[in-house]
């Protein structure tokens, strides 16, 4: 926890943030909570970004006050106004941009005092992979596809039967730039797969880690995928 010190006779209040990541082009959340106040009109929330001289967002007297908002955030920010009274100062950031990455400060003033906490916000692109059997290939082949990643991730194949095996010699990964010229489509092909085995395609960059599993038996194919954001830690 980062605790601010009281100024001008005011006490400090505890403000807590959680480092997070935003998926470019989508909406993101910058998490911040504080010791609540009983009167909404006494609560001021200011979001600041390192290197940006205008405010990211300001909420006071029960409503947004955006006269000093920096241009780069205009029309893209909102707090959860109905949750401010219970101590939620989290910021919704619309249409996350690559340039939104950086250090943010959540600064809170209430009748009890003031406090602030910083958070690191990473931006990139990440998506669920889907693994399929490639019936067009000459040999038993799996194809792992994920539509949007940035920065360029690493792709590693693993199997339940051959644990610890290195599949780099029997796989081929390509990255295709998407139309917006930032994110890339990831395609990885694994050759010489055997039946009655579970294969995992693991895609990872410094923001997220995603895994697509496929279990191939003579009678059925089972798929499962999950995505995990990295480095989410509280301050």
């Amino acid at each position: 926890l980062i605790i601010g010190f009281g100024i001008s006779g005011r006490h400090s209040i505890t403000v807590t943030t959680v480092a997070s990541a935003g998926n470019i082009g989508e909406d993101g959340i910058l998490s911040c909570t504080f010791e609540p106040d009983i009167k909404l009109s006494d609560i001021v929330i200011q979001w600041l970004k390192e290197g940006v001289l205008g405010l990211v967002h300001e909420f006071k007297e029960g409503k947004d006050e955006l006269s000093e908002q920096d241009e780069m955030f205009r029309g893209r920010t909102a707090v959860f106004a109905d949750q401010v009274i219970v101590g939620n100062a989290s910021l919704r950031l619309k249409n996350v941009q690559l340039t939104d990455a950086g250090t943010y400060k959540c600064y809170i003033i209430t009748s009890k005092g003031k406090g602030n906490a910083n958070l690191e916000y990473k931006t990139g692109a990440f998506s669920m992979p889907e693994v399929n059997v490639d019936y067009n290939a000459s040999s038993e082949t799996l194809r792992c596809e994920a539509p949007r990643w940035f920065p360029q991730p690493t792709v590693v194949w693993a199997s339940q039967v051959d644990q610890g095996a290195n599949f780099s010699e029997v796989s081929n990964t390509s990255f295709e730039l998407n139309s917006e010229n930032v994110t890339m489509k990831v395609v990885s092909v694994l050759y010489n797969v055997t039946i009655n085995n579970t294969y995992s395609c693991m895609i990872e960059n410094d923001i997220a880690k995603a895994t697509g599993d496929i279990k191939v038996t003579e009678s059925e194919i089972k798929r499962r995928s999950h995505l995990q954001l990295l480095n989410s830690k509280a301050s």
Partner: antibody, heavy 121, light 107 residues
């Protein structure tokens, strides 16, 4: 030692142009926002312009908007103020100053010694 | 723009006196306020930031207080080197503004 050193001032006719430079040393230049502040003879301080650490955002006082341009060259650790269409009321000592604080909320903690601009025919 | 009004515009005091200068903002600026000292022919020097904080090297006889719209700079015991002009400045708006200054002269 953290230091700012302005240059480029001088005598110029109304309507003329000047470019002020501010050489920074002793700190990581691209992590600090920078300002230009001026002081007319016998008067108080007047904020002129500011630029973010990356150079991506610029800000101007209404009195100079459209005539002055602030910029920075990170490779040269130098801040600039291009002044066009100069007027008599632009006559002042011009200071460059570094903004304290990572979020722009604090004051200006390092100042140059100033360079004098005189606009007169 | 946010107007910053300083008072008095000038004052006369003796060494050892307690001196108080006030600054009023035309709107709430929270604690986004700095104080500067300027001597003739010299660049301003930061005395106080964030309304109450002293930068390293500034003597402890200087102190700042206030938040919102009303702020005070206090010199607890005036020293010979403190005779100068003092300015307040707000950073809440990205149209930064200074107060008109307070000249502290020897009585």
């Amino acid at each position: 030692e953290v230091q700012l050193l302005e240059s480029g001032g001088g005598l110029v006719q109304p309507g003329g142009s000047l470019r002020l430079s501010c050489a920074a040393s002793g700190f990581t230049f691209n992590t600090h926002a920078m300002h230009w502040v001026r002081q007319a003879p016998g008067k108080g301080l007047e904020w002129v312009s500011a630029i973010s650490g990356s150079g991506g955002s610029t800000y101007y006082a209404d009195s100079v908007k459209g005539r002055f341009t602030i910029s920075r060259d990170i490779s040269k650790n130098t801040l600039y103020l291009q002044m066009n269409s100069l007027r008599a009321e632009d006559t002042a000592v011009y200071y460059c100053a570094r903004l304290l604080g990572r979020f722009g909320e604090y004051g200006m903690d390092v100042w140059g010694q100033g360079t004098t601009v005189t606009v007169s025919s | 723009d946010i107007q910053m009004t300083q008072s008095p515009s000038s004052l006369s005091a003796s060494v050892g006196d307690r001196v108080t200068i006030t600054c009023r903002a035309s709107q709430n600026i929270y604690t986004w306020l700095a104080w500067y000292q300027q001597k003739p022919g010299k660049a301003p020097k930061l005395l106080i930031y964030d309304a109450t904080n002293l930068p390293t090297g500034v003597p402890s006889r200087f102190s700042g207080s206030g938040s919102g719209t009303d702020f005070t700079l206090t010199i607890s015991s005036l020293q010979p080197e403190d005779f100068a002009t003092y300015y307040c400045q707000q950073s809440y708006s990205t149209r930064w503004t200074f107060g008109g200054g307070t000249k502290v002269e020897i009585k």
